[in-house]
Interface confidence: low
Amino acid sequence: GIAIPRNSGCPNSEDKNFPRTVMVNLNIHNRNTSTNPKRSSDYYNRSTSPWNLHRNEDPERYPSVIWEAKCRHLGCVKADGNVDYHMNSVPIQQEILVLRREPRHCPNSFRLEKILVSVGCTCVTPIVHHVA
Amino acid sequence: GIAIPRNSGCPNSEDKNFPRTVMVNLNIHNRNTSTNPKRSSDYYNRSTSPWNLHRNEDPERYPSVIWEAKCRHLGCVKADGNVDYHMNSVPIQQEILVLRREPRHCPNSFRLEKILVSVGCTCVTPIVHHVA
């Protein structure tokens, strides 16, 4: 990895497992200052591979609410509104970081956790396996 | 928010800003134990709204490398391989949590940050504004 030059004004850590356990300020800084007109807003409805958003809630996790996309169809929607089953609607998935309370129910102690979430759906050409 | 019952075995916090500053164990627990066959692997190439993945690197951030999707075309790819400009390829975006070193260069002190990333692209019917 890249060597990080140590800043003399850093908080000290007496944790034996340092740097595995770190201090994190939960006052979230949001870098998305400008409202992006391309934000996924209504794409879930206008897409040729439309999806529904399901709420996933877990009080032991931070953030506690995550929205999960589920593709509406196996195929893709054509211009006439019918579904084309020669194409496939598939979920676009991404690994994201969340904080998991550890030990459970502790308000100030977390472990970093990676989870896989479906963000939306896209229409793909299926992989056809020809039998010899 | 939801009240979290306090566990008597929790680490103590003498931080005046508690619970804004918390301890986080960076030993990542990966909940994606099974290899998911639907993982977005080659969808970026097979999609009717294909995308390229650009590496975004920042040593002051955790994770330091994030892959950003950029749609290849303004339109969507038809079955014959040509691009249909009556449809639009648009990025599916998601807000994700990252850790930002704060103060800068400190190895054990972070602030939680929300950033907007493009995960992939989907093909949508454009919104047409008719001029009266």
């Epitope: - | 970026y44 190439n45 390229n52 950029k70 290849r72 075309h73 790819v77 040509n82 691009v83």
Partner: antibody
């Protein structure tokens, strides 16, 4: 008319430095990624470097990494290639080229506008 | 060492179809769309095709491309004398972290 005009080439001794410039006109320079591509005498095209529209991202060919620096001045509509520790194998015609789509694209839309090239000769 | 391999030469008589192959790997053609360039002697290269078979304005539809797996090809139908040039395929390569050109193919129009 969209145009790219390279300058700064010449004859230089091995180990010395040279700075190439590429003046852009006829398009909004600050919206487009830009490349440098070179062609040694009688040889094929070799990609050198690319810079994003805002200068935040730069990528280099292994053969020039650590020796060449690509940069841009959007206020002057100019692309640069700073070449240090020059070697005889750097002898070539150097072209600057514009990415075919505005925004954060590096190659998908191809390199749609090319300059006429400037010749760099590294020889003792 | 180019990441993309092309035949050094190809030829045909006027009116014929000539195909040029471009072979790569998963990190380049297998992951990205291929661009094609034409370079006539003494001139700068010119973009011929990009994306999935898209032509810049002014490029005749005699030029067509295909791409599958880790290879791509350019076909020139109804070959004309002005098509005599060097042709290069190019794309992004993830493992190199950069743009890569093919070795180039010289097309000769016979007769």
């Amino acid at each position: 008319e969209v145009q790219l005009l390279e300058s700064g080439g010449g004859v230089v001794q091995p180990g010395r430095s040279l700075r190439l410039s590429c003046a852009a006109s006829g398009f909004i320079f600050s919206n487009y990624g830009m490349h440098w591509v070179r062609q040694a005498p009688g040889k094929g095209l070799e990609w050198v470097a690319v810079i994003s529209y805002d200068g935040s991202n730069k990528y280099y060919a292994d053969s020039v990494k650590g020796r060449f620096t690509i940069s841009r001045d959007n206020s002057k509509n100019t692309l640069y290639l700073e070449m240090n520790s020059l070697r005889p194998e750097d002898t070539a015609v150097y072209y600057c080229a514009k990415v075919g789509a505005s925004g954060d694209y590096y190659y998908s839309y191809g390199l749609d506008v090319w300059g006429q090239g400037t010749t760099v000769t590294v020889s003792s | 060492q180019s990441g993309l391999t092309q035949p050094p030469s190809a030829s045909g008589t006027p009116g014929q179809t000539v195909s040029i192959s471009c072979s790569g790997s998963n990190s380049n053609i297998g992951s990205h769309s291929v661009n094609w360039y034409q370079q006539v002697p003494g001139a700068a290269p010119k973009l011929l095709m990009y994306g999935i078979g898209q032509r810049p304005s002014g490029v005749p539809d005699r030029f067509s491309v295909s791409q599958s797996g880790t290879s791509a090809s350019l076909a020139i139908s109804g070959l004309q004398s002005e098509d005599e040039a060097d042709y290069y395929c190019a794309t992004w390569d993830d493992s190199l972290g950069g743009y890569v050109f093919g070795s180039g193919t010289k097309v000769t129009v016979l007769g």
